[in-house]
Amino acid sequence: SAGAGSHCQKTSLRVNFEDIGWDSWIIAPKEYEAYECKGGCFFPLADDVTPTKHAIVQTLVHLKFPTKVGKACCVPTKLSPISVLYKDDMGVPTLKYHYEGMSVAECGCR
Amino acid sequence: SAGAGSHCQKTSLRVNFEDIGWDSWIIAPKEYEAYECKGGCFFPLADDVTPTKHAIVQTLVHLKFPTKVGKACCVPTKLSPISVLYKDDMGVPTLKYHYEGMSVAECGCR
């Protein structure tokens, strides 16, 4: 697993809709793979974390002044949709094929 | 200033190119305002941090399992260019009007 000492990467995060109170409107699935971005953005930032110029600059400033400026953060840079079955306002079960931005596709340093 | 207890926001970060070793190729300016995204992504995530659905989900999971899942992270969501003067391969000082992605325009929770 990606601990504090590991580099920014995508890790598993199973989300149960009951745990977050969304089971009141999402019928299915009961849970899904959301993924989580975990790990540090350490110098030098590798290409696979697709750093922006600002992230590169912030990383270099952090190296010089670690107590003043934070590291860049490992976050989702690309999200994927999931399909959900929910009840519409008429109470009719409806399938939304592309419920956008629910699952991490890629992580990066920002 | 945006400490650990404050909400995600844009704060000042003056970057001196000499400090990060970029003065070898950037002639001017000597320093610039890069800004930094600082502060926490606390529940409930406000509209001004433009949270993605995944960030909302992660925040809710963190509320339920704070030791297992991290909070969303306060990062640049929109960047602005700066203008830089540099020497081209002929040694001619050249102005790049739009050196993209160097300064934070907006911060958000991701």
């Epitope: - | 002639i27 001017a28 300016p29 000597k30 320093e31 610039y32 700066i82 203008s83 003067l85 002929m90 001619v92 000082p93 050249t94 102005l95 009007y97």
Partner: antibody, heavy 118, light 111 residues
Amino acid sequence: QVQLVQSGAEVKKPGASVKVSCKASGYTFTRYWMHWVRQAPGQGLEWMGEINPSQGGTNYNEKFKSRVTMTVDKSISTAYMELSRLRSDDTAVYYCAIGANYGGLVYWGQGTLVTVSS
Amino acid sequence: EIVLTQSPATLSLSPGERATLSCRASESLDNYGISFMNWFQQKPGQAPRFLIYAASNQGSGIPARFSGSGSGTDFTLTISSLQPEDTAVYFCQQSKEVPRTFGGGTKVEIK
């Protein structure tokens, strides 16, 4: 190395035109703007205008706009400055200079003396 | 147009002395955090030579004794230790906007 070689001295009568050439070498001609600057005897430097050899776009000093034409021939890496309706106070050394895109004049030609006399 | 005023008109100093030349602009030459001020050296019978650009940066092959400073409207060219070969006229030039303009020049003489 970069070189700008200008055409020879000219003597012109008032009312005539003069066309000064500037042959560039040692770099890609279309890469930098070409500027023209003149200097009357014992006087300071006066910017006349600039031309982008790549597209032919020009910026002229308002003072010369009605009388000056700047052109290029990319095939022979040469810039030209033509000044019409010459007067005696146009007597000067005319320089071409390569300009960085922020307007600094980095390399200069040797100058062309244009004398306007009746 | 931006007017550049140089002072003094003439500077007469001994070898080894420090020369300070001034150039004042009628409006700020700063943009994007960059000062659009350049300095040129012109010796008799020669074309001008690119000396300093963006207020404080030396052109290629320029000796270290030449330095530039300033921002906004006030700029300075300093020759730390005058050499006989520094006898010349020095011009400032703004490249912030068209028309590019030059100062009237400062003549530096060696006593």
